[in-house]
Amino acid sequence: SGPVKELVGSVGGAVTFPLKSKVKQVDSIVWTFNTTPLVTIQPEGGTIIVTQNRNRERVDFPDGGYSLKLSKLKKNDSGIYYVGIYSSSLQQPSTQEYVLHVYEHLSKPKVTIDRQSNKNGTCVINLTCSTDQDGENVTYSWKAVGQGDNQFHDGATLSIAWRSGEKDQALTCMARNPVSNSFSTPVFPQKLCEDAATDLTSLRG
């Protein structure tokens, strides 16, 4: 019995639960998911019983080995998987536990302008980045377009100050989770500030 193995998969994708055994005479292998039986295998007779019929098409054993491949992953496949290898040559079963986290591929991040002010020729804008998958182990960072991979700010919200006459610089937000990353459409501080100024002028008028 080894330490818990952490696995990551993406919705619609596949994950393989690695399993090896040196036991020559394996009587049965039982896989469970959150305490519910998933698959029972008897290698000697070559019988494989998948408890729930809907899972039959999702279960496979790469190269005819003991490792279990689960495909067409869904969010609710996340959880604890446990395998027991039973053999008359073992005093107690050999076991292994896995924790599977299934994540969605990230949608394109949306950038919202939280708050803006324009004082003494300096425009202050708060940009907030979000995706439909917020809170699911999603991290955000900001970078200047054309500046290589160097991110200059970690976090969903970026506060920028743009002074009139400064060179404009496109900014993009990157959202990342364990299975994907996604970039927002670039935003231009100068344009946002000019739009904000226009809006203020029209309000005064």
């Epitope: 020559k24 007779g45 070559g46 019988t47 494989i48 039959r56 190269d63 005819g64 080995g65």
Partner: antibody
Framework: QVQLQQPGAELVRPGASVKLSCKAS????????MNWVKQRPGQGLEWIGM????????RLNQKFKDKATLTVDKSSSTAYMQLSSPTSEDSAVYYC?????????????WGQGTSVTVSS | DIVMTQSQKSMSTSVGDRVSITCKAS??????VAWYQQKPGQSPKLLIY???YRYTGVPDRFTGSGSGTDFTFTISNVQAEDLAVYYC?????????FGAGTKLELK
């Protein structure tokens, strides 16, 4: 990659025993059962037996109990099958084939076969 | 010994067709059946094990089904390279036994 290498052909005199070899590579030889299968010209497949290289446990088709002896040499990852007192009935192609883990009696990798001709 | 009966000795088909080969076990083998493909001059190749599990790398046009004593092997959208002899084998108990084979030929 997994490979099972067998000599292409063996010519044997009637009554003179012959020892066929099967050299395994590309996997842990002592972890998988090794099978031997007979195929007479134009005929189907006939299972002779299987041996586990870790401890040489053998399971033999009773039909071949007086005909075939299965052995292994772990140091060279080679399985052997000796055919005793060959007759024309033993002229056939003999395959070695590795068992899968998940179904220990299904065979996923096969050698190219050794064609045995028994003739005086 | 368990007898595996493949009633069709040969079958004629055309490229693009769907063809099914049947195999009957003389006693219950649960799902302990494998299917092999053998082309002339070549060694057999494992396609299906445990009645319905496709071996790694085998195209998904090959499928297996059945349990107990009745088993079916199906090729959908037959390709020219599928012309071969197909054997069923019970891997439920020793001695392991094979069907006599079904030769797939072009019409």
């Amino acid at each position: 990659q997994v490979q099972l290498q067998q000599p292409g052909a063996e010519l044997v005199r009637p009554g003179a025993s012959v020892k066929l070899s099967c050299k395994a590579s590309g996997y842990s030889f002592t972890t998988y059962w090794m099978n031997w299968v007979k195929q007479r010209p134009g005929q189907g497949l006939e299972w002779i037996g299987m041996i586990h290289p870790s401890d040489s446990e053998t399971r033999l088709n009773q039909k071949f109990k007086d005909k075939a002896t299965l052995t292994v040499d772990k140091s060279s990852s080679t399985a052997y099958m000796q055919l005793s007192s060959p007759t024309s009935e033993d002229s056939a192609v003999y395959y070695c084939a590795r068992s899968t883990m998940i179904a220990t009696r299904a065979m996923d990798y096969w050698g190219q076969g050794t064609s045995v001709t028994v003739s005086s | 010994d368990i007898v595996m009966t493949q009633s069709q000795k040969s079958m004629s088909t055309s490229v693009g067709d769907r063809v099914s080969i049947t195999c009957k076990a003389s006693q219950d083998v649960i799902t302990g059946v494998a299917w092999y493909q053998q082309k002339p001059g070549q060694s057999p190749k494992l396609l299906i094990y445990s009645a319905s599990y496709r071996y790694t790398g085998v195209p998904d046009r090959f499928t297996g089904s059945g349990s107990g004593t009745d088993f079916t092997f199906t090729i959908s959208n037959v390709q020219a390279e599928d012309l071969a002899v197909y054997y069923c084998q019970q891997h439920y108990s020793t001695p392991l036994t094979f069907g006599a084979g079904t030769k797939l030929e072009l019409k």
